[in-house]
Every structure is written in C-alpha cells, then in structure tokens.
Amino acid sequence: KESCDVQLYIKRQSEHRILAGDPFELECPVKYCANRPHVTWCKLNGTTCVKLEDRQTSWKEEKNISFFILHFEPVLPNDNGSYRCSANFQSNLIESHSTTLYVTDVKSASERPSKDEMASRFWA
C-alpha cells in the first residue's frame, strides 16, 4: 500500500547554474494524497533558513505529482545560495533537502558596473 505521507522530492546536493537577468523557476516536487499541504520556500543563511516573504510562488499540478514553484523574474546576483522547501501537513513539518543556485553575472565590467558589482564582482 502506497504511503500517504507528504513527500518532497528534492535530491540531496542538487544544484542549478543560472544566469542573472533571465527568469528561472525553482521547483519543489510535492507528493500528497487528499489535501494539498501548505508549502513554503526559505533561503539558507548559515544554519537558519529565512522564509521567503514577498516572493512570487505558484502550483503546477500534474497527474502523479505537484510542483510548488518559486519564481525568479529575473534572477539577481543576490539570489545565489541554497534553498529549501517545507510542507506543513497535519501539524507535521516536512523539510526538503537543500538545492543550490549558482548565479553568474552576465554584465561585463564595461557595462556600467554598480557599486555593489564593484565591491563583489563574482557570485559564482
């Protein structure tokens, strides 16, 4: 008999190499049975994971699995780092493995580097 526990299918040590300035969707694959759990994204800051408020998220429902998506429109250099999704289900908190975004800044040094860029030219 198939388990009806909520499961989050982010692979251990998964990573994405992405470009700043373009959109990206970070997916959290969620398996559930009857009621869809409440899912959130957070970004790791040392040992704590800071909940991402004010960020655009959406659900994509497929036949056997659903995806809770964190939208980056667009990716920013500051988005570099590790993320985790968490599900609240029947008073239980289920946390995924972390997934890491490696952001490459595509703007060359000749194209009006900002003060932030000058201070920290490379993020990946």
């Epitope: 470009l19 700043a20 300035g21 373009d22 959109p23 408020e53 004010d54 960020r55 655009q56 939208h71 429109e73 667009p74 920013l76 250099p77 500051n78 595509v106 703007k107 060359s108 194209e111 900002s114 932030d116 860029e117 920290s120």
Partner: antibody
C-alpha cells in the same frame, strides 16, 4: 549611449492588430531585457510584458491572450504584436530597458513612446 | 494582482516646503520604485528599490518604507519638482504602477 525608439502605425481600426517595433542602441538584447509599457488616460501606466535576454517572455495576464513579444538580436529590435484592438487600447506605447543590480531589478531607460489611436 | 494606491492624487506645495507622498500596496512587496513624469515626456527613473536615488536626482529627494507602505519625500520643494510621480512594484506579476501623485507648485 543607451537609446530605445518605438515605431508604430499611429492609427489602427477596431478589431485589427497592432505591430510596434522597438529599435535599441547602446546595449545588447542578449544582456538586457526589454519591456513594453503603455499609458492611457483611463488606465494610467500598465506593464504589458517583457522579452528577457535569453529569449523567454513574460506577460501581464490580463491582456496576455492578445499579446505577442518577439525579438531579433542581430538587428537589435524587439517587436510587440497585439490582436483584436478596441478603443480602450488607445494609448502611448513605450519600450523600456530592464536592468538588475545586486539585489533589485528595475526599468531604467525609456523610449520616447509611440502614440496609438484605435478608431474607425 | 497587487494594487498600488497613491495619495494624495494632487498635491500643491510652496517653494521651500517639505513634501511627502505615499504609496500603499494591497499586498507586501520587497521594495518600491518611483518614476517622475512631466507633460509630453516619458517617465524617468527617480528612486530605485525604495531609497536609492537615480542618477542626477537632487539630494533633497528621499524614499522610505517597507511591506505595504512607502513614501517619497522632498525636503524643500523647488519649481522644477512639479511633475507626476508614480510608484511601481516589481515583486509580483503583473508588475503594477500606482495611479500617480501630481505635484504642483503654489
């Protein structure tokens, strides 16, 4: 220096389609996004959509079904096509460059706009 | 969609007077941009990401706020500041603008 220039038909008949070209200089369409924003007396400023550097698009869900944005990187041109125009699509249409900093994104350089009137 | 409500719609100020206009969002946003527009011209970036002045903007302008409430302040009004100011959010698609505050000189 960075410049964006829109060219459009000026007058469009109701139910017809609108095509506007944005020609840019001073930056590459493979590095920066280009947005379309319109301004009408009734609706104020309205973001329509964006052509991202990598070639993907994002649209405002409201007029999305009537909108299409494309580009030609080699000609430094971005195109807006809008179908089934009605009188309330009468507006000034702007193309605008998008740029990111370390932790935010904004529209920085605006074209002078092209005026579109929908009338028979 | 996130609705941005600007107040007041019209503001009249004397030279040298302190001016504050506000922008309220229907949902929390990460930051707010402000644009200035004068009749017959395109909007110009004025304040980026809540508090960063765009290039060439006089230091008498400042921006502040967080969450759902943001403001633009002019420490001492000058004649050249007369214009319409729009707030703009880039947190959630569709990326919306406020209805504008028209600032007039007395």
């Amino acid at each position: 220096q960075v410049q964006l220039k829109e060219s459009g038909p000026g007058l469009v008949a109701p139910s017809q389609s609108l095509s506007i070209t944005c020609t840019v200089s001073g930056f590459s369409l493979t590095t920066y996004g280009v947005h379309w924003v319109r301004q009408s007396p009734g609706k104020g400023l309205e973001w329509l959509g964006v052509m991202w550097p990598g070639g993907r698009t994002s649209y405002n869900p409201a007029p999305m079904s009537r909108l299409s944005i494309s580009k030609d990187n080699s000609k430094s041109q971005v195109f807006l096509k809008m179908n089934s125009l009605q009188t309330d699509d009468t507006a000034m249409y702007y193309c605008v460059r998008g740029d990111y900093e370390y932790d935010y994104y904004a529209m920085d350089y605006w074209g002078q706009g092209t005026s579109v009137t929908v009338s028979s | 969609q996130i609705v941005l409500s600007q107040s007041p719609a019209i503001l009249s100020a004397s030279p040298g007077e302190k001016v504050t206009m506000t922008c309220r969002a229907s949902s929390s946003v990460s930051y707010m941009h402000w644009y200035q527009q004068k009749p017959g011209s395109s909007p110009k970036p004025w304040i980026y990401a809540t508090s960063n002045l765009a290039s060439g903007v006089p230091a008498r302008f400042s921006g502040s706020g967080s969450g759902t409430s943001y403001s633009l302040t002019i420490s001492r009004m000058e004649a050249e500041d007369a214009a319409t100011y729009y707030c703009h959010q880039w947190s959630s698609n569709p990326y919306t603008f406020g209805g504008g505050t028209k600032l007039e000189i007395k």
